[in-house]
């Protein structure tokens, strides 16, 4: 099918920059400023991506391929190239309607964006808790109690807890 | 506005050799393909040579061998060297800016005036 249309159609040679001008007989014309076209044999030139507001430019347009945008400090990307910018929060927290929340007991989140997740529960491995959760971090789980040898450790193997994770205090 | 000016035609005898220059105007040159065309005295026109932007050639086959087809972008002009001309290479040569920068099965948008190449002993 490629061969074609490459044989039926007159425009399917005009190199990727330019377009195949209707208003010139089909010759083969630049592509005007601030528009480019990615592929050859295109009949029109795409408007090139304007990163404005919270977007500010990571490459700029060219002839050939649209300009891609990246977010400012503060802020994050989400979708596919970037077609929103989301609020950054610290660590410890996650971005609600109303804003940045810190996370509940018994959650954390490590990064600047993305949800509290609840701490790894060490016991359903076995495990005891070696290291406690945070806001911040999740929990570091040891080796079950029963590979310890006598005074080997001091670290208490978690009693049932109702909070996933969390050793008594 | 296109503009397409052929010069370098003229009478030279069997054997011999003329280089035609076709100057382009109007369009932006280098991303388009330019072709040359003949028509002989009581003939249709014919296709002869053809180059697109990126250099690619295509020949008719009576003219294999015998004629190449170049172009220099800087200066927006396209030439035709022919060498070991015959009588049967009369004609008036056309220069011809081609749609789609295609040279397989190409056609013509845009023509210039044409230029006068007699061969006789």
């Known amino acids: 099918f490629e061969r074609t249309r490459s044989l039926q159609d007159p425009c399917s040679n005009c190199p990727a920059g330019t377009f195949c001008d209707n208003n010139r007989n089909q010759i083969c014309s630049p592509c005007p400023p601030n528009s480019f076209s990615s592929a050859g044999g295109q009949r029109t030139c795409d408007i090139c991506r304007q990163c404005k507001g919270v977007f500010r430019t990571r490459k700029e347009c060219s002839s050939t391929s649209n300009a891609e945008c990246d977010c400012t400090p503060g802020f994050h990307c989400l979708g596919a190239g970037c077609s929103m910018c989301e609020q950054d929060c610290k660590q410890g927290q996650e971005l609600t309607k109303k804003g940045c929340k810190d996370c509940c007991f018994g959650t954390f989140n490590d990064q600047k964006r993305g949800i509290c997740r609840p701490w790894t529960n060490c016991s359903l491995d076995g495990k005891s808790v070696l290291v406690n959760g945070t806001k911040e971090r999740d929990v570091v789980c040891g080796p079950s109690p029963a590979d310890l040898s006598p005074g080997a450790s001091s670290v208490t193997p978690p009693a049932p807890a109702r909070e996933p994770g969390h050793s008594p205090q | 506005e296109v503009q397409l000016l052929e010069s370098g035609g003229g009478e030279v005898q069997p054997g011999g050799s003329l280089r035609l220059s076709c100057a382009a105007s109007g369009f932006s040159f280098s991303i388009n393909a330019m072709g040359w065309y003949r028509q002989a005295p009581g003939k249709g026109r014919e296709f002869v040579a053809a180059?697109?932007?990126?250099?690619?050639?295509v020949y008719a086959e009576s003219v294999k061998g015998r004629f190449t087809i170049s172009r220099d972008n800087a200066k927006n002009t396209v030439y035709l060297q022919m060498s070991s001309l015959r009588a049967e290479d009369t004609a008036v040569y056309y220069c011809g800016l081609l749609k789609g920068n295609r040279v397989v099965s190409p056609s013509v948008a845009y023509w210039g005036q044409g230029t006068l190449v007699t061969v006789k002993p």
């Open positions: 180059i697109e932007s990126g250099r690619n050639t």
